[in-house]
Structure formats: C-alpha cells, structure tokens
Interface confidence: medium
C-alpha cells in the first residue's frame, strides 16, 4: 500500500533504534572515508526529520523518496570532491541515476587501516560510558569496510557484540572473557560479508532470475516438505529483500526481512517442522536463526526424479509451455532430494538439464536424446566430491596453516601476476574452509566447502576487476558464477608468466617480526612464500618446504637470541643465499 511519507512509514515500522542503525550503515557504506562523527551528525538530522514526518506526513519534503532524502544529505557534505573525487559527480545527476552512481562507487577494498580492537579495559570503559555511541562506532567501522554487508544482519552482530560486552565487562578477567567471544563474532561476520557480497554480485551481474534460482535451490534443500508454490513464494520474497539491500535500500530491506520472518513463523505448518525455536526469539535473532535453520527431515517415499523429468512423454511440451516454471520445479525436486549437494552444483545440474532439453526437444526423437541426462550428471557430481575429499585429506594432514600454504602455492602458480597481498588474503580465506567444513559430517561437507569457496573466489574476482592482471583470472571471473570454482580448480601453472627477479630485500627480515602477533607472523611468512613462487613458479613442493622450514628455523633462532638485531643482520643474508641455492 502507498504511504504519504515513506520515511515516516519506515520509522514507524522499524522503531528509532533500528532506523538510526540502518541509516548509519547506509551512509557508512556509501561514503566510506567519512568519520563516525560526520555520519552520526547526518543520522541525527535524518532521524529528527523522520520524526517531524511521523507527526505530520504532509510536512515539507516528507513525501520525497528515501533515495532523494539520503542522496541530498550525502551531497550536502562539505569537501565532497576533495575527499571522494569523481564520486562527487554523482551529485549532478537526478534520482534514480544518482543512487546508481553512488552504488558504482562503492569500494570493495577501501584503503582503511585494519579494524583494531582496543584493550579490554579501554573497551569496557567506553562501552559503559556510552553504549549507543560505542555500538555506533562498531556499525560504522564494519559498514565502511564492507559496503555490501547485509544491513539487518549487521544489526544482529552489533546486538551480539553488545551482549558480550555487557556480560564480560562485569567479569574480573575481562580479556579472557572477551577475546574468544569477540573472535567468534568477527569470524562469523566476515563469512557473512563474503556470502552477502556473492549474492549482490549474482544480482548485479546476472539479475533477479539468477538470484531467485539460487534461492529456490537453497530453500528447497532446507524445507523439503514445503510445496513448490510455497518455495516459489519464499524465493520471490527473499529475492526482493536481497535486491533492496544490495541496492542500498536498507530500510525497505530490513522491513521486508522482518515481514518475511513473520510470514514464515505464521506458516510453519506448510514450511518446516524446525522453525519453532527460531520463531520464539526476538526479531533480529529470529531472522538470523531462520537464515541458518537446520534442514527439515526429507519426506519418505519421494518418487524418482526421472518420473516427471525424463520418463514422462510430455517433457518437451511441458518445457516449451512454461520454461521457467518447469525448470523451477526440476530445481525444486532435485534440490529437496539433495541436501548433501552444494547450491552451486544444483544450479550446474539445472543448467545442464536446460541445455539438454534445448538441444533434444529440437530433434526428431527427443526422449531418446534426453533419456540419458541423469547419467550425464555423474561427472558434474563427482568433480566437487573429489575436490572435497582431496582437500579435506590435505587439511587433515597439514592443519590450517599448512593447508593455507599449500593453497597459496597452488594459486600463485595459477595466477602469479596477482598482487601478493591479494594472493595471501585469498589463500588464508580459502584455507579456512578446512576448519570450517572438513570437520562436519560427510553429508554436510560438500555444500559447506563449495559454497564457501565460491564466495571467497567471488571476492578474488571483485579485487581483480579493479586491476586486471591475469588472463587466467579474467577467464574464470567472466563466466557464470556457478562455473567459477570449477574453472579456478582446473587452472594449472601459468606458462605465459615471466618469473620475477630475485630481490634480496623481499626476503630480508628484522627483529620487529618477533613481537608481532601469531597471525601477523604467519602473513609475513606467507608473503615470502608467495614471492618465492613468483620467483620460481615451477619449484617443487619439496624445494619450497626446505626453504620454508629453513626460514621458520631462522626466525625461531633469532627471536630467541639475546641480541636479536645482530642475529637478523648476520644470519639473514646467509638465509637468502641458502634459499637461492635451494631453488637453483
């Protein structure tokens, strides 16, 4: 239904706290360099204006669209051109082009320092002094670094953060209470960020139809007892919610997500028997819980998929009359039978089925042609299954750090032109798949591994798009989203690459490395490893292991030495010589 004032409508629906949080996220995701104080001031102005519209929907400007209101606010910021360069040109445009322009200027890799967590005591002090400002800073810092973070989920993580601080700041040993809990939230939030970015990429590059197909597969796996009409309704609603968030319409997105959660809880009987626990929770927790609810028990006695999609004499007629609905029911029926497959795999199978029907239904004897389609799925299913087995075996043998290093070598050989920081970030993220997925029960491994890898590789593609340097990467990134992971897996050593010259300074280290946290030490060592591979792309695993073991031994020795600086300056050059010899 149309509302006289959109801003008053959203303020009423969401309540002041969520309204302010979402407006802050929106501004922080659009203008990523502004300080918290600048954004907080704008948020307060917008909120005050929303309140005047709630009091009188006919008041001046209350009938304007949210894009117009928010865009006008952003464009009124002083020194916009100095700080944001050509983004300021967006302000010369009218809506909806202005908002599109802002979206195009979102930076997936802003040059901001890493978000450092303060000391426990300092954190607790500022949290106790002003919890609202403290949480505002959290929303601002996360949102500006992750301009496509799913806004209602970010409110959920802020709520988690708040609860952890409330609990731990009352403890004697604040540090040991906070660290593991906040690390847990950070890890989950980072995964949430890359997953949502993948959804927005799907929407931006391939449109709503592609996202809806993803949603049908995912929902059918989770709710195998819901019928096709129900799954279609949920997929349509979920597509709308994600389209709004990806498009920067955060108030509408959060409002519609709350509506969807309400609908699901009111219609549990026709959706799933597993929703009750989620539905008992307050809004943010409820929506989060529903998004990762366990799969419902699959109905017994499901007939073989072949009955309707291969053996039925009317397959081509059914396909021709309503292609999307027919393919939708295929995806639904296949997905509900296979919670053990990744969504990417299910979409590849649906694509193969579609291509088979396109080809066969034009032939003289269609049934003879498409009759083997299910058998032709076999290699498509085996490939990711083998990938999971091989990689989980390797992870179990090497542990997370060793597994990351193996992936780093592999990917540096595939795309040595890519910058070392990007390769290290990608390998560290890809390597976490072991810890995240390889410990799960067998039937959950494949969906966990492949859908996580796809999301990480999407980030690799986004970063590479900014500065394309590798033909290998361009080739894999320009295909369809579901083919990316198999494409990257199939890449081999890039034969066109001219090895980097050996530079001693790349492998020269100083005593300051000794005081770095373990994670930073690992990154330094992994940076050296990538550089070694760039110098010798065809080095054997054995050669690289020898060098890295020597390097680790050198660090260990010098960091334990009484005079660390002397040890580094005398032993360092010897290490470099030994490395060159080992790789000669």
């Amino acid at each position: 239904e149309a509302h006289k004032s959109e801003i008053a409508h959203r303020y009423n629906d969401l309540g002041e706290q969520h309204f302010k949080g979402l407006v802050l996220i929106a501004f922080s995701q659009y203008l990523q360099k502004c300080s918290y104080d600048e954004h907080a001031k704008l948020v307060q102005e917008v909120t005050d204006f929303a309140k005047t519209c709630v009091a009188d929907e006919s008041a001046a400007n209350c009938d304007k669209s949210l894009h117009t209101l928010f865009g006008d606010k952003l464009c009124a910021i002083p020194n916009l051109r100095e700080n944001y360069g050509e983004l300021a040109d967006c302000c010369t445009k009218q809506e909806p082009e202005r908002n599109e322009c802002f979206l195009q200027h979102k930076d997936d890799n802003p040059s901001l320092p890493p978000f450092e967590r303060p000391e426990a005591e300092a954190m607790c002090t500022s949290f106790k002094e002003n919890p609202t400002t403290f949480m505002g800073h959290y929303l601002h810092e996360v949102a500006r670094r992750h301009p496509y973070f799913y806004a209602p989920e970010l409110l959920y993580y802020a709520e988690q953060y708040n609860e952890i601080l409330t609990q731990c700041c009352a403890e004697a040993d604040k540090e040991s209470c906070l660290t593991p809990k906040l690390d847990g939230v950070k890890e989950k939030a980072l995964v949430s960020s890359v997953r949502q970015r993948m959804k927005c990429s799907s929407m931006q590059k391939f449109g709503e139809r592609a996202f809806k197909a993803w949603a049908v597969a995912r929902l059918s796996q989770t709710f195998p007892n819901a019928d096709f009409a129900e799954i279609t309704k949920l997929a349509t609603d979920l597509t709308k919610v994600n389209k709004e968030c990806c498009h920067g319409d955060l108030l509408e997105c959060a409002d519609d997500r709350a509506e969807l959660a309400k609908y699901m809880c009111e219609n549990q009987a026709t959706i799933s028997s597993k929703l009750q626990t989620c539905c008992d929770k307050p809004l943010l927790k409820k929506a989060h819980c529903l998004s990762e609810v366990e799969h419902d028990t699959m109905p017994a006695d499901l007939p073989a998929i072949a009955a309707d999609f291969v053996e039925d004499q009317e397959v081509c007629k059914n396909y021709a009359e309503a292609k999307d609905v027919f393919l939708g029911t295929f995806l639904y029926e296949y997905s509900r039978r296979h919670p053990d497959y990744s969504v990417s795999l299910l979409l590849r199978l649906a694509k193969k089925y579609e291509a088979t029907l396109e080809k066969c239904c034009a032939e003289a004897n269609p049934p003879a042609c498409y009759g083997t389609v299910l058998a032709e799925f076999q290699p498509l299913v085996e490939e990711p299954k083998n990938l999971v087995k091989t990689n989980c075996d390797l992870y179990e043998k090497l542990g997370e750090y060793g597994f990351q290093n193996a992936i780093l070598v592999r990917y540096t050989q595939k795309a040595p032109q890519v910058s070392t920081p990007t390769l290290v970030e990608a390998a560290r993220n890809l390597g976490r798949v072991g810890t995240k997925c390889c410990t799960l029960p067998e039937d959950q491994r494949l969906p966990c591994v492949e859908d996580y890898l796809s999301a990480i590789l999407n980030r690799v593609c986004l970063l590479h798009e900014k500065t394309p340097v590798s033909e290998h990467v361009t080739k894999c990134c320009s295909g369809s989203l579901v083919e990316r992971r198999p494409c990257f897996s199939a890449l081999t050593v890039d034969e066109t690459y001219v090895p980097k010259e050996f530079k001693a300074e790349t492998f020269t280290f100083h005593s300051d490395i000794c005081t770095l946290p373990e994670k930073e030490k690992q990154i330094k060592k992994q940076t050296a490893l990538a550089e070694l591979v760039k110098h010798k792309p065809k080095a054997t695993a054995e050669q690289l292991k020898t060098v890295m073991d020597d390097f680790a031994q050198f660090l260990d020795t010098c960091c334990k030495a009484a005079d660390k600086d002397t040890c580094f300056s005398t032993e360092g050059p010897n290490l470099v010589t030994r490395c060159k010899d080992a790789l000669a």
């Epitope: 195998p224 007892n225 819901a226 019928d227 096709f228 009409a229 129900e230 009987a269 026709t270 959706i271 799933s272 109905p299 017994a300 006695d301 499901l302 007939p303 009955a307 309707d308 039925d312 004499q313 009317e314 007629k317 059914n318 009359e321 309503a322 609905v325 027919f326 029911t329 639904y332 029926e333 509900r336």
Partner: nanobody, 116 residues
Framework: AVQLVDSGGGLVQPGGSLRLSCAAS????????MSWVRQYPGKEPEWVSS????????RYADSVKGRFSISRDNAKNTLYLQMNSLKPEDTAEYYC?????????RTQGTQVTVSS
C-alpha cells in the same frame, strides 16, 4: 503468483463419498503433474495419488487403491479427487500439490471427516 485453492471437504458417514477440487492459477497447469496429499494431526504429510500433465497416467497409494480416483480438467485449471467407500481412517486434511511428490502445501487444505 502460483496459487492453489482446495475445496469439497466435509463430514461424511463411513461408506459415503466426497469429491475434492483444487483450483490452480499463476502457472501453466496442463504442463505439470499434480498430486493429492493428506495430513493427519501432528503427523508428516502422506502421498495419496498423482496424475501427469496430460491426465492419462494416474498413481495411487495402496491404502486408497480402488476407492479413490484422481482426474483433471486442464481447460478449467482444476484437479479433482473422487473419494468413494470412505473409512474413518481417511479422516485428515487433504490438499493438492504441484508435481508428483509429498510436500506440505501452502493452501489451507480441505478437512475430510469420516464418522458415524
């Protein structure tokens, strides 16, 4: 949007008959196999019968074979279930679904009660 509306349920004595209807809209009805499913309170849904898109291939659960008959009218976008020789154990909520499968339906379903 895809919509299915069930009707025709009611209270009937053992041995009596009922005819259920399911009106479909929002999709190419004649292109799809359809099913009737029933659900007892607190139990998982149970497949009853299904029919292909053209209407010449019908299948039935053993418990209803010989008593129930599924049919469709593609011109009217409607699916039917003729239920004869009803027994108390046929008391359940009945609903139609797209495809030949068991699933919970978003429709309210239509209640069939067989009791003397």
């Amino acid at each position: 949007a895809v919509q299915l509306v069930d009707s025709g349920g009611g209270l009937v004595q053992p041995g009596g008959s009922l005819r259920l209807s399911c009106a479909a809209s929002g999709f190419s009805f004649g292109s799809f196999g359809m099913s009737w499913v029933r659900q007892y309170p607190g139990k998982e849904p149970e497949w009853v019968s299904s029919i292909n898109g053209r209407g010449d291939d019908t299948r039935y659960a053993d418990s209803v074979k010989g008593r129930f008959s599924i049919s469709r009218d593609n011109a009217k976008n409607t699916l039917y279930l003729q239920m004869n020789s009803l027994k108390p154990e046929d008391t359940a909520e009945y609903y139609c679904t797209i495809g030949r499968s068991v699933s919970r339906s978003r429709t309210q379903g239509t209640q069939v009660t067989v009791s003397s």
